[in-house]
Structures are given as structure tokens and as C-alpha cells.
């Protein structure tokens, strides 16, 4: 099997308040099986930003058709952005249980926001 | 209320085509990929065909390939089974399958019988 | 192909388990349709390996592990009867697969 990598391609991401922020991950391999999804943090005290397996998200929409079976991207886009969302996106793949357990993270995105413009 | 309605079933001779449709409606149909399976009489359940939710990919078990083409109009919440070349063993009840995140099923149709004799 | 018992008997009250055989674990998730008569529109009772639908009792639950995916309907009642299908994805594949079948009677 191809081990999975996840890649975020972006070490970083600036975005004025209001507009839209795309923050992109690939994986490598479908396998194993097991949803993906991003966190704005990491630790305890993560936020949960996009769940492949459950939404809606009303923010955040995939950049790709996930509903393809063969799909290997997971970018989101996440509108109107605000001084709030401002911090480090990781995407990162789940492998299926009960629970679902943490199998691989990207290396993450870190979003500034800029103010708007005026 | 979820619903999947299917039509299009009826009576036709080996070698003739048929076009089922499945009508969807209480979700937001152009955010899930959709399949077709089909149950002939005394058998078991068979997974035919899939798309994803905008359409652009398709996905068929090799006994229908060729034969059978899957679509789906968004816009007005349908979903298609064009079938051409159909013999005695396509003779079955076809439901239309609302696609989960991982592509099996959460919501089916009530059916629609199709019966291929001369 | 995925392999499950032909039928499988209870009485009212008790666990039933029907097992399905035949998915790679790394690759294959399963679900559990229940289907009340033939030609009648099936009814998913578990989806993803142990995710049951909101609208489906609580009795019903299921488990995966290794090759095999369980279904378990604890307390089984005489309206559970019913043959129960169970389907797979394989990611490999891109093709969903169902089992024979299992008819539960309830005595």
C-alpha cells in the first residue's frame, strides 16, 4: 500500500476581513478508509472547522466534488472572513472505528487576516 | 421528508430500451451523489450504477456497462437510468439510493418494476 | 462478495447477531438494509459500520472489525421480521457489493 501523505501546500494564507479564504489539501491515497477533517488549532482546544462525514458547515464549502469516489482533495473555502479566524488549519485524515481515531495530519496553513479595506 | 419516487418501469421486449426516472425531493439534491440497484424477482439486492452529485463522474458494475448510462438533472431534482439492449435478466424491481458521505445508502425509492419478455 | 447466513431464528426478547464476511477492513465500509417483503423498498438500519439513522430504534446497532461487520438488534421484536442485506463499499473497487441476505424469523 502507498503510505498516505496529506499535503498542504500553503504554509500560509492572508485574506482581507470579509472576503473568502481557500486553504487546500490533497492526500495521497484513499486508504485507509476514514473521513477527513480540518481543525483551526490543534491540542484540546481545537475548533472543529469541516467534518467530511457530517454539516452542515454553513461557512465552509469543499473547493472539489468530494462525492467523487475517486476524490484525493480536500481544500475548503471558508466565507466572510473575520479577525476571529484567524490562526493554524490543519487537515487531517481519520481512519473509521468507533470512534474514529486520528490517523495523519497535514503540515498546516496558518490564516492572517488583513483588515478591510476601505 | 426525504422522498425518492421512481417511474419509468413497464413492460418492453429483449433488445428494446427504457428510460426510468427517480424523483427526489426534501433534500438538497445536487449535494449527493445517487445510485441505481436493482432486485430481480426471488434474488438478492444489485448495485448497478453511481454518479457523484454534480454529475461529471459515473461508476457501473461491468455487467451494465455500455448498456446502461446513469444522469441526473439538478435543477430538476431527477435522476436517470437510460437502459438499451435489455434481455429477460434485467427483469427486476430498480430502486433509486441517495449516496452517504461513504457511498452506501441511507434513503431508497419504492421501486419501480421493469419486465423484459417477448 | 460478501457472505452472510441464509436465515437465522430468534424469539422475542432476545440478541440476534448476523455477521457478514468478505470486506477488507482498511478499505471497505459497511451498512445493513432491511427489506420486509420482496419488491418492498428496503430500509437502512445501519450505515458507515455502526451509525444508525435517527429515525431507525435504538435496538439496532453494529460493529466492524477485521474482515466482518455485525448487526445486532437486541430485544428483537416480532416486527424485525425481515431480511437484512448486508452492502459494502470497497474504495478500491468504487463498486458497492450486497450480501445474499439473511431472513430473521421471530418465533
Known amino acids: 500500500e502507498e503510505e498516505l501523505q496529506i499535503i498542504q501546500p500553503d504554509k500560509s494564507v492572508s485574506v482581507a476581513a470579509g472576503e473568502s479564504a481557500i486553504l487546500h489539501c490533497t492526500i495521497t491515497s484513499l486508504f485507509p478508509v476514514g473521513p477527513i477533517q480540518w481543525f483551526r488549532g490543534a491540542g484540546p482546544a481545537r475548533v472543529l472547522i469541516y467534518n467530511q462525514r457530517q454539516g452542515p458547515f454553513p461557512r465552509v464549502t469543499t473547493v472539489s466534488e468530494t462525492t467523487k469516489r475517486e476524490n484525493m482533495d480536500f481544500s475548503i473555502s471558508i466565507s466572510n472572513i473575520t479577525p476571529a479566524d484567524a490562526g493554524t488549519y490543519y487537515c487531517i485524515k481519520f481512519r473509521k472505528g468507533s470512534p474514529d481515531t486520528e490517523f495523519k495530519s497535514g503540515a498546516g496553513t496558518e490564516l492572517s487576516v488583513r483588515a478591510k479595506p476601505s | 421528508d426525504v422522498q425518492l419516487v421512481e417511474s419509468g418501469g413497464g413492460v418492453v421486449r429483449p433488445g428494446e430500451s427504457l428510460r426510468l426516472s427517480c424523483a427526489a425531493s426534501g433534500f438538497t439534491f445536487s449535494s449527493y451523489a445517487m445510485s441505481w440497484v436493482r432486485q430481480a424477482p426471488g434474488k438478492g439486492l444489485e448495485w448497478l450504477a453511481g454518479?457523484?452529485?454534480?454529475?461529471?463522474?459515473?461508476y457501473y458494475i461491468d455487467s451494465v456497462k455500455g448498456r446502461f448510462t446513469i444522469s441526473r438533472d439538478n435543477p430538476k431534482n431527477s435522476l436517470y437510468l437510460q437502459m438499451s439492449s435489455l434481455t429477460a435478466e434485467d427483469t427486476a424491481v430498480y430502486y433509486c439510493?441517495?449516496?452517504?458521505?461513504?457511498?452506501?445508502?441511507?434513503?431508497w425509492g419504492l421501486g419501480t418494476l421493469v419486465t423484459v419478455s417477448s | 462478495a460478501l457472505t452472510q447466513p441464509a436465515s437465522v431464528s430468534a424469539n422475542p426478547g432476545e440478541t440476534v447477531k448476523i455477521t457478514c464476511s468478505g470486506g477488507d477492513y482498511y478499505s471497505t465500509y459497511y451498512a445493513w438494509y432491511q427489506q420486509k417483503s420482496p419488491g418492498s423498498a428496503p430500509v437502512t438500519v445501519i450505515?458507515?459500520?455502526?451509525k444508525r439513522p435517527s429515525d431507525i430504534p435504538s435496538r439496532f446497532s453494529g460493529s466492524a472489525s477485521g474482515s466482518a461487520a455485525t448487526l445486532i438488534i437486541t430485544g428483537v421484536r416480532v416486527e424485525d421480521e425481515a431480511v437484512y442485506y448486508c452492502?459494502?463499499?470497497?474504495?478500491?473497487?468504487?463498486?458497492?457489493?450486497f450480501g445474499a441476505g439473511t431472513t430473521l424469523t421471530v418465533l
Open positions: 454518479i457523484s452529485a454534480g454529475g461529471s463522474d459515473t
Open positions: 450505515h458507515s459500520d455502526d
Open positions: 439510493a441517495r449516496e452517504t458521505w461513504n457511498h452506501l445508502f441511507d434513503y
Open positions: 452492502g459494502g463499499y470497497d474504495g478500491r473497487t468504487y463498486i458497492n457489493t
